[in-house]
Interface confidence: medium
């Protein structure tokens, strides 16, 4: 448990031309006031997304009557903190979310009118207990500052505020300067306030304003080299006669922080205090820049000059994602037509068309008639991948160009004799056939098994093909 | 949670070789790019090289042809061969996970070398 903690220091026109005289608009006077909201985690989280980690809405600020011949001032801002409580473990990265609301009190309809006057989103990294973190935010043409800190609450220790401890005065053995926590718990509450000065390595205290050196140094402070001890072969944690510790071997042996971070014991345990740009247990983790190469598969890195501020990767064709670590499937987005099958073969797509169909994308139908008229009287027929002239009697070739002898085909059955004819062929049939390619036999009695000769046409006459 | 651990520094003659190997635990391989960089006393930490998911391979200029990088994902190891050491390599070696899902990098311990001439 515990309560994160956001301090305006001051809200004005950002700096450069065309920024704003008044946050008030013409109507009269407005007074601002703050709405803080926090989400967990670094990502970056749609704005109407829940403020999981709790919100806050400030108090009214006074009252703001534009001056017209006085300069642009900072804002009169409402007073406090803005606090919002956790009741959770603090997530350590988190987003922070500061809105600027002007509230306008001319003489609306219905009470005074609310508007989002400007917006600041930060990602950020910050340890509970530490110390107040100073920013300054640009939002359009507005200048936010503010300070914030993460504390704990309710006898809540650690950068987490995830270890409870219940004061204990008994002396302990728990460690230089840690006190032991209630018999439930076996963690320790933080440390007295030693001497200031006191060597943060060399020194330690266990009542507030004290402090006692380890073996090897001495002075008030414990920065002096002791060049000789006067807890040479002493064993256990102390001399009454001294005052001096000889420690064993502790849980911040070999220093387990990272990144150089520094260590301090507690019982059984140890925690590190580390670096600007790291955090973690151990101090292992850090943000990640564009010195860190983010930009796999030759994407171009842009921006991130440190671990608070964002990058983005710009990446090559073919790749995707906010690393560029992702290849896309161009296939996916079906980008051949007509049924062609799409190849990636990671420089280029390739279409393989089916039949009748060309073109990159297999756009083009080889079968399409249009453009493509057939000469004399010809008709154009789609299909069979491509395009085809039925043509007129007496015409051939692709394009129905070519003057063609109807006769040459033989289509007189049965010895008839064939006629070229302008507009087809005429056969004459031999004695006993008849039909428009002497295909019918014809009965003695002069009846024909099959439907009889057109009026006017006796068996045996030539007769046209119509 | 993420934790990497390497091991196989120590002091060489230069034009030596020495592998380095990192166990990392807690790794996901398919959001995270291992890597390895390096911190000369006085200096700033740099990238020396890192395996990219997908296999793609980044050396800097200074070690190309020189180190070779690898990860076994089914040892959760990740290796720095290092060969024809030279003086300029001495540094503490360090084990990276690059995590961009939590946008953030893991950190080992490191690992000295010393290249003596």
């Known amino acids: 448990a515990g309560v994160f903690e956001l301090q305006i220091h001051s809200f004005g026109p950002g700096p450069g031309p065309g920024a704003p005289r008044s946050p008030c608009s013409a109507r009269g006077p407005c007074r601002l006031f703050f709405r803080v909201c926090l989400k967990p985690g670094l990502s970056e989280e749609a704005a109407e997304s829940p403020c999981a980690l709790g919100a806050a809405l400030s108090a009214r600020g006074p009252v703001y009557t534009e001056q017209p011949e006085a300069p642009a001032p900072d804002l009169p801002l409402p007073n406090g903190l803005l606090q919002v409580p956790f009741r959770d473990a603090w997530p350590g990265t988190f987003s922070l979310i500061i809105e600027t609301w002007r509230e306008e009190l001319g003489d609306q309809i219905g009470g005074p009118a609310w508007s989002l006057l400007a917006r600041v989103t930060r990602r950020r990294r910050l340890a509970a207990g530490g110390p107040w973190a100073r920013d300054i935010q640009r939002a359009g043409a507005w200048e936010l500052r503010f300070s914030y800190r993460a504390r704990c609450e309710l006898l809540a220790v650690g950068t987490a505020c995830t270890r409870l401890c219940r004061p204990r005065s008994a002396p302990s053995r728990c460690g230089p300067g840690l006190r032991p926590c209630a018999p439930l718990e076996d963690e320790c509450e933080a440390p007295p306030v030693c001497r200031a000065g006191c060597s943060l390595e060399h020194g330690f205290c266990e009542q507030p304003g004290e402090c006692r050196c380890l073996e090897g140094w001495t002075g008030p402070l414990c920065t002096v080299p002791a060049s000789t001890s006067s807890c040479l072969g002493l064993r256990g944690p102390s001399s009454a006669t001294t005052g001096c510790l000889v420690p064993g071997p502790g849980p911040c042996d070999g220093n387990p922080c990272a990144n150089g971070g520094s260590c301090s014991e507690t019982p059984g345990s140890f925690e590190c205090t580390c670096p600007r740009g790291f955090y973690g247990l151990r101090c292992e983790v850090s943000g990640v820049t564009c010195a860190d190469g983010p930009c796999f598969n030759g994407g171009l890195c842009v921006g991130g000059a440190d671990p608070d501020s964002a990058y983005i990767c710009h990446c090559p064709p073919g790749f995707q994602g906010s690393n560029c670590e992702k290849r896309v499937d161009r296939c996916s987005l079906q980008p051949c037509r007509n049924g062609g099958l799409c190849l990636d073969l990671g420089h280029a797509l390739r279409c393989r068309c089916r039949a009748g169909f060309a073109g990159p994308r297999c756009e083009h139908n080889l079968d399409d008639c249009a453009g493509r008229a057939c000469a004399n009287g010809g008709t154009c027929v789609e299909g069979g991948g491509a395009h085809r002239c039925s043509c007129a009697l007496g015409f051939g070739g692709r394009d129905c160009r070519e003057r063609a002898d109807p006769c040459a085909a033989r289509p007189c059955a049965h010895g008839g004799r064939c006629y070229a004819h302008f507009s087809g062929l005429v056969c004459a049939c031999a004695p006993g056939y008849m039909g428009s390619r002497c295909e019918f036999p014809v009965h003695p009695d002069g009846v024909s098994a099959l439907p009889a000769a057109p009026p006017g046409l006796r068996p045996g006459d030539p007769q046209r093909y119509l | 949670q993420v934790q990497l651990k390497e091991s196989g520094g120590g002091s060489i003659q230069a034009g030596g070789s020495l592998r380095l190997s990192c166990a990392a635990s807690?790794?996901?391989?398919?959001?995270?790019?291992m890597g390895w960089y390096r911190q000369a006393p006085g200096k700033g930490r740099e990238l020396v090289s890192r395996?990219?998911?997908?296999?793609?391979?980044y050396y800097a200029d200074s070690v190309k042809g020189r180190f070779t990088v690898s990860q076994d994902n089914a040892k959760n190891t990740v290796s720095l061969q290092m060969n024809s050491l030279k003086p300029e390599d001495t540094a503490m070696y360090y084990c990276?996970?690059?995590?961009?899902?939590?946008?953030?990098?893991?950190w080992g311990q490191g690992t000295q070398v010393t290249v003596s001439s």
């Open positions: 395996i990219q998911p997908g296999g793609n391979t």
């Open positions: 990276n996970a690059l995590c961009w899902r939590e946008n953030v990098n893991y």
């Open positions: 807690g790794v996901s391989y398919n959001r995270c790019s």
